[in-house]
Amino acid sequence: FERTRSLQDPCSNCPAGTFCDNNRNQICSPCPPNSFSSAGGQRTCDICRQCKGVFRTRKECSSTSNAECDCTPGFHCLGAGCSMCEQDCKQGQELTKKGCKDCCFGTFNDQKRGICRPWTNCSLDGKSVLVNGTKERDVVCGPSPADLSPGASSVTPPAPAREPGHSPQ
C-alpha cells in the first residue's frame, strides 16, 4: 500500500479506506482490520459494526464501508440501519411485554410485526360490512344499504374472459 502525503493539508489526499495518521507524521495509512473509512481525509477509521446474536450479516464490512446487519429468522429489523431486532409474531397477534398475544375482538394484524389495529368502521363512510373482520383481516366494506335497492347488484360484473394464447388487440 502506497503511503502518501500532500504538501498542503496533509490529510486532504487520504482516500476512503485510509486514515491520516497522527502518529506517523500524518501519512495516509490503510484502515486496520475490522475498521473502515467511508470518506477521504479522516484522521481515524471507524470500527466495523459486528452482527452478533440475533443480528446476522447482510453485507460484510470493507475498508470503505460498514457492515450491514439484518435479523435472524423469527425476528425483524427496527430502527435506522436495523439497530434493533424484534421478535416476529403470527398474523392475528401483536408483541407485548409478555410475548405474542392474540388481537382483541374488533382488532386485527395482517403482518408478523406491529400492533393490532381496529377494524374499519364501515358506517362512518355510510357503508355496510360486506365481509366480517377477523384477527388477521380487516372488514371489507360494501355499498351503503341504500344502494342495495331491489334489482341493484352489489357485485361488479367480471371482465370478459380472453381465450388462452390470444393477446389483446
Epitope: F19, D21, N22, N23, R24, S29, C31, P32, R43, T44
Partner: antibody
C-alpha cells in the same frame, strides 16, 4: 481482560536514570500504541509520548524529548520508559495507557495504575 | 500545541443532579475530543471518545456534546460513584493535550 500493570513506586537518586515498566496482558500487544502520561500531585495530565510495539515507532512531546526514552520488549509484552538525569521536577506519577492503531479518536481506552516516582537523595 | 482549558476546576453538586463540565480547545479540533474520569484512588477510565461516543461499559447517564472548539460532558443523574476528577483530551494532533481537570464533589 485488558490489563496494564505498573509497579506502585520507585525511589530514585537525583541524576540516576530510572526505567519504568508497563506489562500488558489480555490483548494483542503489537496492535495498540502505548502512551506515557505524567501527573504531578494535584495537577493535570501531560502526554509524554507513545510507541507502537509492532515496529517501535515513537512520538515524543518536545517538552520530554531529552528526558524520556520509550522502548518495548515484544517477547514479554512490556513497554518501558527511561527517565534520564532525574530532578525533583520529575517526581510524579507516570501512567501508561493504550490506544488502538487507526481508530477510536486517539482515545486512551485502558490505563495502568501508575508508578509513583520520588526523586530524593 | 493545542491548549485545552477546563475553566471550572471544582464543582459541587447534589446526588441526582444534572451536571455539565465544559472544555475549550485553543483551535478547532473537529470532534476529536475524549473524556476521562479519575477516581480519588488514581484509577483512570475512558468515558467518551470522539465527542459523544460512549465507551463500552460506561453508564448511559454520561453523555458528551460539542463541536469546533467547545465541548461538554454531562452527567444526567449524579450518583455517589461519580465523585471524581474529569479530564478532557484532544486527539486531533500531536502532542496530545489534556485539560486541567474538573473535580466533582458532593454538596
Amino acid at each position: 481482560q485488558v490489563q496494564l500493570q505498573q509497579p506502585g513506586a520507585e525511589l530514585v537518586r537525583p541524576g540516576a536514570s530510572v526505567k519504568l515498566s508497563c506489562k500488558a496482558s489480555g490483548y494483542t500487544f503489537t496492535s495498540y500504541w502505548i502512551n506515557w502520561v505524567k501527573q504531578r500531585p494535584g495537577q493535570g495530565l501531560e502526554w509524554i509520548g507513545n510507541i507502537y510495539p509492532s515496529d517501535s515507532y515513537t512520538n515524543y512531546n518536545q517538552k520530554f524529548k531529552d528526558k524520556a526514552t520509550l522502548t518495548v520488549d515484544k517477547s514479554s509484552s512490556t513497554a518501558y520508559m527511561q527517565l534520564s538525569s532525574p530532578t525533583s521536577e520529575d517526581s510524579a506519577v507516570y501512567l501508561c495507557t493504550r490506544f488502538p492503531d487507526g481508530y477510536y479518536s486517539y482515545a486512551m481506552d485502558y490505563w495502568g495504575q501508575g508508578t509513583s516516582v520520588t526523586v530524593s537523595s | 500545541d493545542i491548549q485545552m482549558t477546563q475553566t471550572t476546576s471544582s464543582l459541587s453538586a447534589s446526588l441526582g443532579d444534572r451536571v455539565t463540565i465544559s472544555c475549550r480547545a485553543s483551535q478547532d479540533i473537529s470532534n476529536y475530543l475524549n473524556w476521562y474520569q479519575q477516581k480519588p484512588d488514581g484509577t483512570v477510565k475512558l468515558l467518551i471518545y470522539y465527542t459523544s461516543r460512549l465507551h463500552s461499559g460506561v453508564p448511559s447517564r454520561f453523555s458528551g456534546s460539542g463541536s469546533g472548539t467547545d465541548y461538554s460532558l454531562t452527567i444526567s443523574n449524579l450518583e455517589q460513584e461519580d465523585i471524581a476528577t474529569y479530564f478532557c483530551q484532544q486527539g486531533y494532533t500531536l502532542p496530545y493535550t489534556f485539560g486541567g481537570g474538573t473535580k466533582l464533589e458532593i454538596k
